[in-house]
């Protein structure tokens, strides 16, 4: 399954929207920095592109879940958030089309359950951090920057796999 070119454009638009969502400077939130332990090796490295698809799908689904909470709606600009949801939704559709075709399911041992669990735990650590920090503006800014970093890493790894094939 070849993801459409629009998928790459969508990834770039998602990153642009995340950048535009910034409300305060990360430098004013240095004391709130946190290592969430992003499992970046699970998005590329020794995998074939097909094997990363369920993992990338999980990543985008978790981003969608994280930013579609009541607390998130209160933290970010509503117009940008709506555009962000639309981009994520389209990317989920692209990836689901690939999964339905059987790539990443029939050829993937254990459906990469270990990688998917690692991604879920990563997002739960983020959720717990926000809760502990009482969803403060600095906590949300740390999370926004973290999601930009991890999303960029995961999509870059996907792109490098695509170019190798």
């Amino acid at each position: 399954c070849d993801l459409p070119q629009t998928h790459s454009l969508g990834s770039r638009r998602t990153l642009m929207l995340l950048a535009q969502m910034r409300r305060i400077s990360l430098f004013s939130c240095l004391k709130d920095r946190h290592d969430f332990g992003f499992p970046q090796e699970e998005f590329g490295n020794q995998f074939q592109k097909a094997e990363t698809i369920p993992v990338l799908h999980e990543m985008i689904q978790q981003i969608f879940n994280l930013f579609s909470t009541k607390d998130s709606s209160a933290a970010w600009d509503e117009t940008l958030l709506d555009k962000f949801y639309t981009e994520l939704y389209q990317q989920l559709n692209d990836l689901e089309a690939c999964v339905i075709q059987g790539v990443g399911v029939t050829e993937t041992p254990l459906m990469k359950e270990d990688s998917i669990l690692a991604v879920r735990k990563y997002f739960q650590r983020i959720t717990l951090y926000l809760k502990e920090k009482k969803y403060s503006p600095c906590a949300w800014e740390v999370v926004r920057a973290e999601i930009m970093r991890s999303f960029s890493l995961s999509t870059n790894l996907q792109e490098s796999l695509r170019s190798k094939e």
């Epitope: 332990g37 699970e42 490295n45 020794q46 254990l110 990469k112 270990d114 735990k121 739960q124």
Partner: antibody, heavy 119, light 111 residues
């Protein structure tokens, strides 16, 4: 029949680095999460860490800095960076087929390899 | 660091009887169900009995039953057999994998 076996255990002096190796039979290591667990003589089990199918490594708190887990296409290695007498134990390599239920659900275990750290 | 406390540390059971082993975590395991139970006999590696708190591993007799959620878990062995004499361990998986750990173990003696 799918199995794992550890090797490399021996008597070492404190501070001498030692690498244990886990070899798989009947399956590809690249497709599974593989962990290391140890057991001191007459004591309980201790979770050291795990390497996921993609290569991400997690260590338990006390093991960080003391051990390094790495994976190649044919082996999973556990390097003891600077062993002390407290690291004397049988070291087990294990695989989980149930990673959705956590990284402690190991269902295929090797027989273990004994490491003795003594001066 | 998380602590998994197993009680009792040793228990005696008659053949045909029932044994219950408790495993208490100082914090909820991941997803409230990421807890496994193992059986270990002297000189052998551990054997997985239960994963996901209550799912029986392949080839394990239905006499073994896992229950519980969150922080409190129980392994129950009914119709105890001589072959069940062993040490049993619980193992917890947490949202932060640096906290993954085994319980201290429970020795089951069969009379």
């Amino acid at each position: 029949c799918q199995s794992v076996e550890e090797s490399g255990g021996r008597l070492v002096t404190p501070g001498t680095p030692l690498t244990l190796t886990c070899i798989a039979s009947g399956f590809s290591l690249s497709s599974y999460a593989m962990g290391w667990v140890r057991q001191a003589p007459g004591k309980g089990l201790e979770w050291i860490g795990i390497v996921l199918s993609g290569g991400t490594v997690y260590y338990t708190n006390w093991a960080k800095g003391r051990f390094t887990i790495s994976k190649t296409s044919s082996t999973v290695d556990l390097k003891m960076t600077s062993p002390t007498t407290e690291d004397t134990a049988t070291y087990f390599c294990a695989r989980t087929d149930y990673p959705a239920y956590g990284f402690t659900s190991f269902n295929i275990w090797g027989p273990g390899t004994l490491v003795t750290v003594s001066s | 660091a998380q602590v998994l406390t197993q009680t009792p540390s040793s228990v005696s059971a008659a053949v045909g009887g029932t044994v219950s082993i408790s495993c208490q975590s100082s914090k909820s395991v991941y997803n409230n169900n990421c807890l496994s139970w193992f059986q270990q006999k002297p000189g052998q590696p551990p054997k997985l009995l239960i994963y996901g708190a209550s799912t029986l591993a392949s080839g394990v007799p239905s006499r073994f039953k896992g229950s519980g959620s969150g922080t409190q878990f129980t392994l129950t062995i009914s119709d105890v057999q001589c072959d069940d004499a062993a040490t049993y361990y619980c193992a917890g998986d947490y949202v932060d994998d640096m906290e993954n750990t085994f319980g201290g173990g429970t020795e089951v003696v069969v009379k």
